[in-house]
Interface confidence: medium
């Protein structure tokens, strides 16, 4: 029988009445155009909704926008358009919400052609009040908040000026001209690239990388011949043009650009690209595009300095055309990532790693599913997940895979079961153990979201017809109840719940269409009465993550340690609550060769855990350029995997000697760096 329809499914008592009492409808007095929704702060219940409507006139486009505010998680909305003087807001800039719980909001207004600069509306009290500010420039990008201080903003102008505000947009100063890209780093540092000659495009590969640590009082050139740069974790990356040809290489710095090392990665040509797929303070996943328009490349994982890289996955799908990759960090379990590969026959297959890119495997076939037409052997196949690439190809996939850090082990995704991703209508699958095992959860495509840290999963069928039914599960997707939230079906456009999956409220957005008009409408459902009581100790059970063989001493060991979690029992219908904190008990593992990656000059032959010397380097001194100095490496070929906490066990020896010789890549050495002050 289909999931949720077997006898074992216990029904939640009186849920219709409970949900009916907690369903709130709001009809927006708007013609249907576009709608955008932003949450302001964490656990504040404040939502801002911006509706915009364009009327194309003969000579120009007439635009109208409205701003609404809720402070009860979307149950009621108040029209606050008058707070922004009924001004038309530019949706391409969205609503710039401040970091953490700063309560700051910046809206960028549309201004008439001849004006000297743009206009913004600023709020620092969770959108209760707004201040209008006229800008001395026309913004090209959304205002960017400093992660450390929400009063510091930066923006690029349409004339490529870099503008900074130190008082939350009240006063602006142009700190540099001819800027292509600017990003906040740590400690209120700004990194940016500049062009010298014509433009960003013309100077690509000849840009300079600059840094200011005092909001534009003084500057330091930290890189030349730059193609582009990126920040990931504690790493600063720059792709740099080679001296002799049109190839470029990645350089990496861990000290804000004071010193650089050349990453041990392949160089790329004009048509290729590098991409930081994921980064944390320990390591980085880097995609290196293959030559030619292949649509794939190679994933490499770094060491703790971002310098030495190990090949992680071949034929990694990353289209050059649309720039789509399926690479997904499964946030509900440490070390787990999912992505797609393009196989030799051009079919797309899903791969998963449980150890941060050390090994990749296919996803296990769900117990309750048959292999589809793509499978050569009807008894042996895998689950393949639909993600960004499928969505970009307009397949019937309404949502990317979903996981939440506080809903431990849960992953929800659309997929098909066979030898490769199928273009047929997908079903929804769930894993409750971080991707090791999967079950078909819902037939056909759905929108889905996680509430109450996994205590409730909500889903709505993806349909071209109007809908009025929502499905919910209190047992991690095993059994489903359906609730009719309105008599009059609506054209569904999206599900909205507060980021972080701690809320028990869900908003269903859509529009109603009548003979003459269509209007935006939202239904907010509060599930608090479904989960009547707070969870107690007896509602939780101990779960060992990454457990594959309980009889193995090393069972559950990933990156040198194992973790036991307290997980809500599937049979418990209770509230984790907004203050729920994941309870975990870590335990260190013994070191084995699996806890080490191969050092510079070494590689792992396939299906072998030992690192062996690269033939071309055999017998040579291992000397390499690090931080602008020549280093001599004495190694038996191993370096601990970043973030690995193992102790005892195998302990390969490693030593690096400074040869006290200067060396530079073609990039720059500290002597070449210059500083200047404004």
């Amino acid at each position: 029988s289909a999931p949720g329809e077997d006898e074992e499914c216990g029904r939640v008592r009186d849920f219709v009445a409970k949900l009916a009492n907690n369903t709130h409808q709001h009809v927006f007095d708007d013609l249907r155009g576009s709608v955008s929704l932003s949450w302001v702060g964490d656990s504040t219940g404040v939502i801002l909704v911006l509706t915009t409507f364009h009327v194309p006139l003969v000579i120009m486009t007439f635009g109208q926008s409205k701003l609404y505010r809720s402070e009860d998680y979307g149950k009621n909305f108040k029209d606050i358009t008058d707070l922004i003087n009924n001004t038309f807001i530019r949706t391409e800039f969205g609503m710039a919400i401040g970091p953490e719980n700063s309560g700051k909001v910046v809206l960028t207004a549309e201004v008439s052609g001849g004006s000297r600069g743009g206009r913004i509306f600023r709020s620092s009290d969770f959108a209760k009040n707004f201040v209008q500010t006229d800008l001395p420039f026309h913004p090209l990008t959304q205002m960017m908040y400093s992660p450390q201080n929400s009063d510091y903003l930066l923006a690029l102008s349409t004339e490529n000026g870099l503008w900074v505000s130190k008082n939350f947009g009240g006063k602006w100063e142009e700190i540099h001209k001819a800027v292509c890209l600017a990003k906040w780093g740590s400690d209120n540092t700004i990194f940016f690239t500049t062009y010298a000659n014509g433009s960003c495009k013309a100077d690509l590969g000849a840009l300079e990388l600059w840094r200011t640590s005092d909001l534009g009082k003084s500057f330091k050139t930290i890189g030349v011949k730059i193609y582009s740069f990126g920040l990931g974790g504690r790493f600063l990356f720059a792709s740099v043009m080679a001296d002799k040809d049109t190839t470029r290489r990645i350089h990496v710095s861990t000290d804000q650009g004071d010193t650089w090392s050349m990453a041990q990665l392949p160089s790329v040509g004009q048509e290729q690209f590098y991409s930081i797929l994921a980064a944390n303070d320990d390591m980085v996943f880097m995609h290196v595009d293959e030559p030619g328009d292949t649509g794939f490349g190679t994933i490499f994982t770094s060491d703790d300095r971002g310098i030495v890289y190990s090949k992680s996955l071949d034929r990694h799908l990353y289209t050059t055309t649309g720039g789509e990759t399926d690479f997904t960090n499964v946030t509900s379990l440490r070390g787990v990532y999912i992505t797609s590969v393009l196989s030799e026959d051009n079919s797309i297959q899903t791969m998963i790693t449980f150890d941060q890119g050390g090994r990749w495997t296919h996803l296990r076939k769900p117990e309750n599913s048959e292999c589809d037409a793509t499978a050569k052997n009807k008894n042996e196949c895998s689950l393949h997940i639909h993600a960004s690439y499928s969505i970009s190809q307009k397949l019937n996939v309404p949502m990317a895979p979903l996981s939440e850090p506080n809903a431990v082990g849960i992953v929800i995704a659309h997929g098909s079961v066979g030898d490769a991703i199928s273009v047929m209508v997908p079903d929804v699958y769930i894993s409750d153990d971080g991707g090791y095992s999967w079950t078909k959860m819902l037939e056909g495509p759905h929108y889905y979201t996680i509430l109450d840290s996994g205590g409730i999963i909500v889903a709505i069928e993806h349909s071209s017809r109007p809908i009025n039914v929502i499905k919910f599960s209190t047992d991690e997707g095993q059994c489903w109840q359906t609730y009719t939230f309105t008599r009059d079906p609506i054209y569904f456009t999206g599900l909205a719940s507060e980021p972080g999956a701690r809320s028990m409220n869900i908003s269903i957005w859509g529009f109603t269409e009548s003979f003459l008009t269509s209007q935006w409408v939202s239904y907010t459902i509060d599930f608090k009465d479904i989960l009547e009581r707070n969870c107690e100790e007896k509602d939780y059970t101990i779960w060992l993550a990454h457990s594959t063989d309980p009889e193995d001493y090393e069972d559950g060991c990933i990156l040198g340690y194992k973790e036991q979690f307290l997980r809500l029992r599937k049979s418990s219908v209770c509230q984790n609550g907004r203050d729920y904190v994941v309870t975990k008990q870590p335990s260190i593992c013994l070191c084995s060769l699996e806890d080490f990656l191969c050092d510079f000059g070494y590689y792992r032959p396939e299906n072998d855990s030992k690192c062996v010397e690269q033939p071309e380097l055999k017998g040579h001194d291992l000397e390499f350029c690090l931080y602008g100095r020549e280093e001599h490496l004495t190694t038996n070929g191993y370096r601990k995997i970043p973030g690995d906490k193992c102790q005892g066990g195998v302990n390969p020896v490693r030593e690096v000697k400074d040869l006290k010789k200067k060396c530079t890549s073609n990039f720059l050495s500290p002597e070449k760096q210059n500083s200047k002050s404004n």
Epitope: D549, E551, Y553, D555, P586, S587, L590, G648
Partner: antibody
């Protein structure tokens, strides 16, 4: 109950090898490390190494490297320690000991269950 | 290798006495220290692991303390069955090393 039963006493000549067995019962053999520790007459305890029965990986003390081999047979839940090129100062009681399994952060290699010991005498 | 030095190497005490044995590591071993009791002709028995955690089944009169390089085993009230040799053991780094032992005799 959990116990480790070792093979009987051995008398060997210098230069020979000895293989001591240790049969585990009352717990899952592969889920715990097995250490080997020896004690010369009237002396203290000396750690020789461990074997991880689940994968067969080993870690030996430098002093015994090249002379000791630790193996296991999971089908009969038995660990073995073989010491070659015996000398008279290898005369000792040899113990196998189960490694305590950490319940939280790494707690080091405690040994919570010990075999009764096997006396090995090396004499010409 | 990390050297473990136990003191005293032997001591005489009476039933009911409070007994303290110390163990010093040649370098810091955090709290990765275990204590064992061994009676003549018998295998050692784990008393304390991770410097201060009491192994299940061991009487509460035994306690351990310390971290870094200096550790202590205390028997709050010596019982007749406690006369034995006590060993400390570090398990921070390979190779595992034991102290020389402390023999507790009847006064």
């Amino acid at each position: 109950q959990v116990q480790l039963v070792q093979s009987g006493a051995e008398v060997k000549k210098p230069g020979a090898s000895v293989k001591v067995s240790c049969k585990a019962s009352g717990y899952t053999f592969t889920a715990y490390l097995m250490h080997w520790v020896r004690q010369a007459p009237g002396q203290g305890l000396e750690w020789m190494g461990w074997i991880n029965p689940s994968g067969g990986s080993t870690s030996y003390a430098q002093k015994f490297q090249g002379r000791v081999t630790m193996t296991r047979d999971t089908s009969i839940s038995t660990a073995y320690m073989e010491l070659s090129r015996l000398r008279s100062d290898d005369t000792a009681v040899y113990y196998c000991a189960r490694g305590k399994r950490s319940s939280g952060w790494y707690e080091g290699y405690g040994m919570d269950v010990w075999g009764q010991g096997t006396t090995v005498t090396v004499s010409s | 290798d990390i050297q473990m030095t136990q003191s005293p190497s032997s001591l005489s005490a009476s039933v009911g006495d409070r007994v303290t044995i110390t163990c010093r590591a040649s370098q810091s071993i955090s709290s990765y220290l275990n204590w064992y009791q061994q009676k003549p002709g018998k295998a050692p028995k784990l008393l304390i692991y991770a410097a201060s955690s009491l192994q299940s089944g061991v009487p509460s009169r035994f306690s351990g303390s310390g971290s870094g390089t200096d550790f202590t085993l205390t028997i709050s009230s010596l019982q007749p069955e406690d006369f034995a040799t006590y060993y400390c053991q570090q398990s921070d780094v390979s190779p595992i090393t034991f102290g020389g032992g402390t023999k507790v005799e009847i006064k």
